[in-house]
């Protein structure tokens, strides 16, 4: 797994370094995640052929990922940092769910789908600390999550694997515009 | 060619119990989720467990109707399912399938062995 | 859980008809557009046996004249032309989710 964000050897080797702002810390924390992502994705896709599946079959799913939309207020065109902030990790909230059924998924990676996990739920951390509004922020209920989990853990083998395919994929795609909303604010 | 042998069946008193064993060949058995369903005049098909080993990691599922009474296991150096069934009941009778789960979903099955709860 | 309701529980065809068996999921079994049907021909004293998969998919040496078709939650069997050999039991089963179910049956004789 690789190294967490703040304790790299650059860091060691440079102790008189600024330390990092609370902007550079997230931006820092959104790349390591998309590095583990990226390293997940590499496992599932030697595994089985999800990843030359058409965008028409994942389109047609029927799990309610996160997904950057215009009304969001995170793309260039209408941007508004504090609605953007609060999709960002109401985003990230819901996304947990899914990344909790992604834990057994992996053989190699196990590790790497640990680390993904847990320095997602530090990002939410700094971010909650960013924004301003927190009551605009909702928290998925865990009743309905416990029960999503069941249904996503009982799907036949094929199923499992396009929905790896498919979280990995949403998930890497909601961080990539939640980084570029972020270095707007 | 997929084959399934089911052995153990036959006559139980009520609260009793049986195991069932079932011997697969034809295919790469350890990658498979293995299953025990059975068939009974009154019921029809009904599933009963499922094993499934998922990135070295064993998840097991029972129907309701026997949780806490049957349980699944395997041995994949024997490439074998077995189902050990405790405090059996009159509606446990029927016919138990050894059935693999593949990939994409559907079944293949055994020829069955018949378990009759009686007194 | 997914509960499958089919119909009709009984039917009798001449030779050389077409019979049809529908089958209602109470949910959809269908994700990433494939639907998870299967369908089980079942002759006295015998396992079942697979004739359609992924509600269109043939099993292997099963003969042309058996075809599946719907989707999300109607789906239904086609024998055609029927011939003497087809008189069984036929169920259909969700592969979707764990708890794999099964409809109640539906006996087909020759008329």
């Known amino acids: 797994a690789p190294v967490p964000p703040g304790e790299d050897s650059k860091d060691v080797a440079a102790p008189h370094r600024q330390p990092l702002t609370s902007s550079e810390r997230i931006d820092k924390q959104i790349r390591y995640i998309l590095d583990g992502i990226s390293a997940l994705r590499k496992e599932t896709c030697n595994k089985s052929n999800m990843c030359e599946s058409s965008k028409e079959a994942l389109a047609e799913n029927n799990l309610n990922l996160p997904k950057m939309a215009e009304k969001d207020g995170c793309f260039q065109s209408g941007f508004n940092e504090e609605t953007c902030l609060v999709k960002i990790i109401t985003g990230l909230l819901e996304f947990e769910v899914y990344l909790e059924y992604l834990q057994n998924r992996f053989e190699s990676s196990e590790e790497q789908a640990r680390a993904v996990q847990m320095s997602t739920k530090v990002l939410i951390q700094f971010l909650q600390k960013k924004a301003k509004n927190l009551d605009a922020i909702t928290t998925p209920d865990p009743t309905t999550n416990a029960s999503l989990l069941t249904k996503l853990q009982a799907q036949n083998q094929w199923l499992q694997d396009m929905t790896t395919h498919l979280i990995l994929r949403s998930f890497k795609e909601f961080l990539q515009s939640s980084l570029r909303a972020l270095r707007q604010m | 060619e997929v084959k399934f042998e089911e052995s153990g069946g036959g006559l139980v008193q009520p609260g009793g119990s049986m195991k069932l064993s079932c011997v697969a060949s034809?295919?790469?058995?350890?990658?498979?989720?293995m299953n025990w369903v059975r068939q009974s005049p009154e019921k029809g098909l009904e599933w009963v467990a499922e094993?499934?080993?998922?990135?070295?990691?064993?998840?097991?599922y029972y129907a309701e109707s026997v949780k806490g009474r049957f349980t699944i296991s395997r041995d994949d150096s024997k490439s074998s399912v077995y189902l050990q069934m405790n405090n059996l009941r009159a509606e446990d009778t029927g016919i138990y399938y050894c059935a693999s789960l593949f990939y994409d979903g559907y079944l293949h099955w055994g020829q069955g062995t018949l378990v009759t709860v009686s007194s | 859980d997914i509960v499958l309701t089919q119909s009709p529980a009984s039917l009798a065809v001449s030779l050389g008809q077409r019979a049809t068996i529908s089958c209602r999921a109470s949910?959809?079994?269908?994700?990433?557009?494939?639907?998870?049907m299967n369908w089980f021909q079942q002759k006295p004293g015998q396992p079942p046996k697979l004739l359609i998969y992924?509600?269109?998919n043939q099993g292997s040496g099963v003969p042309a004249r058996f075809s599946g078709s719907g989707s999300g939650t109607d789906f239904s069997l086609n024998i055609h032309p029927m011939e003497e050999d087809d008189s069984a039991m036929y169920f259909c089963?969700?592969?979707?989710?764990?708890?794999?179910?099964f409809g109640g049956g539906t006996k087909v004789e020759i008329k």
């Open positions: 094993i499934r080993l998922t990135s070295n990691k064993q998840a097991i």
């Open positions: 034809g295919f790469s058995f350890s990658n498979y989720w």
């Open positions: 949910e959809s079994v269908g994700n990433f557009g494939i639907s998870f």
């Open positions: 089963q969700q592969s979707k989710e764990i708890p794999w179910t």
């Open positions: 992924t509600a269109s």
